[in-house]
């Protein structure tokens, strides 16, 4: 058991151009607070996946009002550390998310409004008991400077807080086979009498006779890897003969979730859905009150004035979970049109539009012809994110800039001769044919196949095509 501690040193504009606007104003004074979320291992999970190692909220910082015309300075911070207690072994590698939240203190109906200013995330290796580690993370134009460490709670010691120490029974030295507890030289390492056969690499115990597993291992002796191979059986230890998995104990066998939590298997391990008032990887953390700020993402905490009375988190729209720690998948309603990609940013939905579409929901089919002139009297035709020109007679090409040879396609039938003309083409028909393209035969008796020849034209005259 132990505590992860986070100390925020500063939050303000990062170096370089494009300083952010102050988040507060004279009309809307505000104050900051921070949330930290920890997950074991070097996971790259989404921000809203469970904070399996734990989470904490800071106190609210001092009220800040922007000075008109002044650049955004480093903003006033809450006092104290953010502390995330962990009951199990410290995993050594962890992922963190640190969120900077703004609480607006204007005249909003229904109390203050919360909004996420910045979120930074990272993956680190850290041994418990080591010195403070310093870090700088940037989120857009903001910069966050902080330090962190993991420390064991007595009687636990060691880089994973799995060794136990007890006060010396004799003043001079420890018992046979027991080392002094660095850095507590006046204490001795307690003999860990775990369940017989408990894996020394993957198991540990805090009470005599138990065998508790590190993440990724399961079974009564912590010898069964949680991950599975590509065989048909969903879980279990490898079979030496086939290399495949044979049925064995699953991660939810025996229900590792404490305090009435329900267990569900995940591809890599298990997840506990905790009853209200409990959280942590195994629902083991309790005694939480509203003063501890257990509701994330702007959730409103009611009740829970003392550790014996349960609190309730009233989640803002879009969040769920007993601590408002999970985001509802609003993108499943597919609000983006025309094949746009939906992104749920928490404070808003965003659509990434396909080429040729724009607007908050990709609802606008871009006017492909805007600013696209078709030359020489051509007209622009739009569609499908592209444009094309319908050219006037005698012109061609993408923008109707090329002069077309109207005779190139040999439009005059029955041996008629084609002449290019400023307004198109003219066919001089061979004897016995007439029409704009010489398409009509003239009958031997002088009558044509047409009802009547146009006035002023004799069969055989050149026909101009308009």
């Amino acid at each position: 058991a132990g505590v992860f501690e986070l100390q925020i040193h500063s939050f303000g504009p990062g170096p370089g151009p494009g300083a952010p606007r102050s988040p507060c104003s004279a009309r809307l004074p505000c104050r900051l607070f921070f949330r930290v979320c920890l997950k074991p291992g070097l996971s790259e999970e989404a921000a809203e996946s469970p904070c399996a190692l734990g989470a904490a909220l800071s106190a609210r910082g001092p009220v800040y009002t922007e000075q008109p015309g002044a650049p955004a300075p480093d903003l006033p911070l809450p006092d104290g550390l953010l502390q995330v207690p962990f009951r199990d072994a410290w995993p050594g590698t962890f992922s963190f998310i640190i969120e900077t939240w703004r609480e607006e203190l204007g005249d909003q109906i229904g109390g203050p409004a919360w909004s996420l200013l910045a979120r930074v995330a990272g993956r680190r290796r850290l041994a418990a008991g080591g010195p403070w580690a310093r870090d700088i993370q940037r989120a857009g134009a903001w910069e966050l400077r902080f330090s962190y460490r993991a420390r064991c709670e007595p009687p636990a010691v060691g880089t994973a807080c799995t060794r136990l120490c007890r006060p010396r029974s004799a003043p001079s030295r420890c018992g046979p086979g027991l080392r002094p507890c660095a850095p507590l030289e006046d204490e001795c390492e307690a003999p860990l009498v775990c369940r017989a056969g408990c894996s020394p690499e993957h198991g540990f115990c805090e009470q005599p006779g138990e065998c508790r597993c590190l993440e990724g291992w399961t079974g009564p002796l912590c010898t069964v890897p949680v991950s599975t191979s590509s065989c048909l059986s969903p879980r279990g230890p490898s079979s030496a003969t086939t290399g495949c998995l044979v049925p064995g104990p699953g991660p939810c066998d025996g229900n590792p979730c404490a305090n009435g939590g329900s267990c569900s298997e995940t591809p890599r391990s298990f997840e506990c859905t905790c009853p209200r008032g409990f959280y942590g990887l195994r629902c083991e953390v309790s005694g939480v009150t509203c003063a501890d700020g257990p509701c994330f993402n702007g959730g409103l905490c009611v009740g829970g004035a003392d550790p014996d009375s349960a609190y309730i988190c009233h989640c803002p729209p879009g969040f769920q979970g007993s601590n408002c720690e999970k985001r509802v998948d609003r993108c499943s309603l597919q609000p983006c049109r025309n094949g746009g990609l939906c992104l749920d940013l928490g404070h808003a939905l965003r659509c990434r539009c396909r080429a040729g579409f724009a607007g908050p929901r990709c609802e606008h089919d871009l006017d492909d012809c805007a600013g696209r002139a078709c030359a020489n009297g051509g007209t622009c035709v739009e569609g499908g994110g592209a444009h094309r020109c319908s050219c006037a007679l005698g012109f061609g090409g993408r923008d109707c800039r090329e002069r077309a040879d109207p005779c190139a396609a040999r439009p005059c039938a029955h041996g008629g001769r084609c002449y290019a003309h400023f307004s198109g083409l003219v066919c001089a028909c061979a004897p016995g044919y007439m029409g704009a393209r010489c398409e009509f035969p003239v009958h031997p008796d002088g009558a044509s196949a047409l009802p009547a020849a146009p006035p002023g034209l004799r069969p055989g005259d050149p026909q101009r095509y308009l």
Epitope: R330, L333, Q334, P335, R337, R361
Partner: nanobody, 120 residues
């Protein structure tokens, strides 16, 4: 401000039917997408059925063939006709809408929820 008001929830026996209604009101210029989510105790909130931004109809696999979503554009209302109800359909059903406001901004809104209980 936009309000989504659900109605029609209640208790029904397995195999029975219910019809939920959700009416949107307020400073709405247009409704882009609208549908129904549900949340069973201890479970994540999940989409049940909806009209997408493109106007298509989508359903969760578990309700296909049993639930039908419809709408009345003139009344800014969507309906969920639920038939052949099962015990696992027990949940709080929430109306959700992605709305374009008079300001031309888009906002996503939730209703307060209506409880559907299926038990013998």
């Amino acid at each position: 401000e936009v309000q989504l008001v659900e109605s029609g929830g209640g208790e029904v026996q397995p195999g029975g039917s219910l019809r939920l209604s959700c009416a949107a009101s307020g400073s709405i210029l247009s409704i882009n997408a609208m549908g129904w989510y549900r949340q069973a105790p201890g479970k994540q909130r999940e989409l049940v059925a909806g009209f997408t931004g493109d106007g298509n109809t989508i359903y969760a696999e578990s309700v296909k063939g049993r639930f039908t979503i419809s709408r009345d554009n003139a009344k800014n209302t969507v309906y969920l006709q639920m038939s052949s109800l099962r015990a696992e359909d027990t949940a709080v059903y929430y109306c959700a809408a992605d709305v374009q406001l008079f300001s031309r901004d888009y906002e996503f809104y939730w209703g307060q929820g209506t409880l559907v209980t299926v038990k013998p």
